[in-house]
């Protein structure tokens, strides 16, 4: 018998969509075969309608698309509006059409039931509103309106224009009977539930005069939306409940294996742990929609999601929801990368951030999550250059090493910058990832002076000091400005005496201007690097003043003064719901990237030896 | 919680015909699933069929040792599944579970069935 299994019968009605998931061995022969569906006619010959490498027969064209997870061994094909014409036979199967590896697979797509003549039909989703309408004869105006549902062979009255109404129907039916002229009255009733599926009668009046009208509704359990994202990437559910609980709190949950449904997050500020640092509720519009962003995608998030609306912010039966089937692709065209990054108080970090390398003239952003209420995470910087103005110094975005990834550098650490951070383009909304920023004990690794006033005219020496471990780096001084850091000549001065157990590795890099000019005033880094992956850097504040005393000044960082007071901006920050993360050769150190080419202006020198090791303190 | 109750079994000749019931309650609402398993002394449990289904689409899944001979069906309104079983043999004699699940991977694994029964004997003589 053949080691492929799936549903032998599939049965729905016109309009709908199935999800027809079939197994195979995991082998690693099978994972990579080529998946189909087809279907069986009368020769016995299987017509593939569409397989896992991109065909799609015209019939199938905009309905239909398959979808492979090789590491649970099973494809899946999704089929939407149904008509009767796909009933009929199919196989689902591994590699050739004729070939044995296959699943006999039956679909019937019927019409759904017989209704009596005139019957009007209602379908309507379970939680929301529905409005019957039910038409009568001038005679009847001043009868009894009343409507009935039909259960079995008996009538069961539910409401009625003498005010009855059935308890089951109570505080969520109303009948309205409309001024004279208006030969319609509508019964409406709220939060819909499941057990409200069937057939109504409308009636007004009694006796053989009596108006009937047959209404047959259909309450509908939310059908999951099926979702498939890669490991560690991103998923948005748009959740839209109807303007009746637009302003009624709203939630995601999960189900879990008791059958209820754990909030994630929910709008009177709840949020599952498990979520922390990845999850954003992204405020409702006037008519009541909201969406959820997770970043950080991880098998474990696997499952079935309702957002639903409810005052307690969790799920009630007979309120609106909608539905979601979560898949997480382990075979993820998303990197690997670190989670969380190490840097030491004092120190600097590097994060690499992934993109989708099909789009590196997407706008890249980075920004800080918020947990507070609903989770927001306000920019910082982005590509084109604009900074937090209490990040100015200390913060870049650079485009290397391209192809796929960019890196954010944030160095002068404290134990405030702890947190989580997002990666985002505004292109695919797949790519955001979080990353976390730990703060440890330690020391940072290169040594620079404090605050550094320069005089007009003079030449200014700056001093880095790299520890031997570092021996093996290209060390390099630039210029930072909001739109980068701007790569400055550096003079390598031989073996630092800040370092005792490796003087002859160690290295003392200077920056020196000469002259010091009014445009030389800003921040400065040194910094590590190999090749276009940058490791630590240390930032230095120089103030330019008029010229008082005669002679050159060298800085040493025994005359350092403390950094100076970072500017802070008013929060009115435009927030993102995007992306973030980084590259997988990185896992143990950050790196930088940028060559940011010349410096107009300034300085002159050269730059010392390059080359990589690992990290130490203020990295990961 | 979902309480799973099943009925019908009974002693059977081997050529009839038997239908088992499996009546669910509490908080059905999510169940995505529901199934049959048995097991026969001294085996292990096996799987025998499964019923899954998304608003008003059904899935059918059936061991290739029941294929043609037993059916599953579903009755949304009595929150009840159904096993009709035909040309009955002397190797389906075991005890049938009902089990229900909220999301399968796999229909054929008993592990990822949240709910179960407590069986009901299925034997038949030859």
């Known amino acids: 018998k053949s080691p492929v299994f799936g549903p032998q019968e599939v049965s729905s009605v016109e309009g709908n969509s199935v999800s027809i998931k079939c197994y195979y061995p995991p082998t690693s022969v099978n994972r990579h075969t080529r998946k189909y569906w087809c279907r069986k006619g009368a020769s016995g010959r299987c017509i593939t309608l569409v397989s896992s490498e991109g065909y799609v027969s015209s019939n199938y064209a905009g309905r239909a698309n398959l979808t492979n997870f090789p590491e649970n061994g099973t494809f899946v094909v999704n089929i939407a509006q149904l008509s009767r014409d796909d009933s009929g036979h199919y196989k689902c199967g591994l590699g050739i059409n004729s070939r044995g590896l296959s699943f006999d697979v039956s679909l019937e797509v019927s019409q759904g039931p017989e209704l009596p003549n005139g019957t009007e039909v209602y379908t309507v989703d379970v939680g929301r509103t529905v409005t019957i309408k039910c038409p009568f004869k001038t005679e009847n105006a001043p009868k009894t309106k009343a409507l009935y549902k039909k259960i079995g062979q008996t009538s069961v009255l539910v409401i009625d224009s003498r005010n009855y109404v059935n308890p089951n129907y109570k505080d969520r039916i109303r009948l309205r009977i409309p001024g004279t002229g208006q030969l319609i009255f509508t019964v409406v009733i709220d939060r819909l539930r499941l057990s409200d599926h069937g057939l109504y009668l409308c009636q007004a009046g009694d006796g053989s005069n009596r108006d009937e009208k047959n209404a047959d509704l259909q309450v509908l359990e939310p059908e999951p939306e099926l979702v498939y994202e890669d490991l560690r990437g991103s998923v948005t559910f748009h959740c839209a409940l109807g303007l009746e609980v637009a302003n009624v709190a709203k939630f995601l949950c999960r189900v879990n294996s008791r059958e209820t449904c754990d909030v994630v997050i929910n709008t009177l500020g709840k949020r599952d742990s498990a979520f922390e640092g990845r999850i954003l509720l992204n405020p409702q519009d006037k008519d009541g929609s909201f969406s959820v962003v997770i970043t950080g995608l991880r098998k474990e998030d696997e499952g079935r999601y309702l957002c639903g609306a409810h005052s307690d912010g969790q799920l009630q039966e007979g309120w609106p929801i909608q539905a979601w089937q979560l898949f997480v692709n382990e075979e993820s065209t998303i990197p690997r990368s670190p989670t969380v990054v190490k840097g030491v108080a004092g120190g600097s970090v590097a994060v690499l951030c992934p993109y989708n390398p099909k789009e590196s003239q997407s706008l890249k952003y980075w920004c800080l999550w918020e947990g507070a209420q609903n989770g927001r995470c306000p920019l910082l910087v982005e590509s084109q250059g604009l900074v937090q103005e209490q990040y100015e110094g200390r913060l870049s975005l650079l485009q290397e090493p391209g192809n796929g990834t960019f890196t954010v550098i944030l160095n002068q650490l404290t134990t405030q910058d702890a947190g989580f951070y997002w990666c985002l383009t505004n292109g695919d909304t797949r790519w955001r990832t979080t990353v976390e920023i730990k703060i440890i004990e330690g020391e940072p690794n290169l040594k620079v002076p404090g605050n550094v006033t320069a005089v007009l005219g003079e030449t200014l020496n700056i001093p880095c000091h790299f520890p031997c471990k570092f021996s093996s780096y290209e060390k390099y001084w630039c210029k930072w400005s909001n739109t980068g850091c701007q790569t400055l000549p550096s003079q390598d001065e031989g073996p630092s005496e800040a370092f005792v157990n490796c003087d002859e590795n160690s290295r003392l890099v200077s920056l020196t201007l000469n002259p010091v000019t009014r445009a030389d005033e800003g921040w400065y880094w040194c910094g590590v690097k190999q090749g276009h992956f940058y490791g630590e850097t240390a930032a230095v504040y120089v103030a330019v003043e008029e010229k008082k005393v005669a002679g050159s000044r060298y800085v040493s960082p025994a005359k350092a003064d403390a950094a100076p007071d970072e500017k802070v901006l008013d929060s009115g920050v435009r927030e993102i719901e995007n992306k973030a993360i980084q590259d997988p050769r990185l896992f143990a150190e950050e790196k930088v990237v940028a060559d940011t080419g010349d410096q107009a202006g300034g300085s002159r020198a050269s730059v010392d030896s390059s080359s990589s090791e690992e990290q130490g303190g203020s990295s990961k | 919680e979902v309480q799973l109750v099943e009925s019908g079994g009974g002693l059977v000749q081997a050529g009839d015909s038997l239908r088992l019931s499996c009546a669910a309650s509490g908080r059905t609402f999510t169940t995505y699933g529901v199934g049959w398993f048995r097991q026969a002394p001294g085996k292990e449990r096996e799987f025998v069929t499964t019923i899954t289904w998304s608003g008003s689409t059904n899935y059918k899944y059936y061991a290739d040792s029941v294929k043609g001979r037993f059916t599953i069906s579903r009755d949304n309104a009595k929150n009840t599944v159904y096993l009709q079983m035909n040309s009955l043999k002397p190797d389906d004699t075991a005890v049938y579970y009902c089990?229900?699940?909220?999301?399968?991977?796999?229909?054929?694994?008993?592990?990822?069935?949240?709910?179960w029964g407590q069986g009901t004997q299925v034997t038949v003589s030859s």
């Open positions: 089990a229900a699940s909220t999301v399968l991977t796999d229909p054929r694994v008993p592990t990822e069935y949240d709910y």
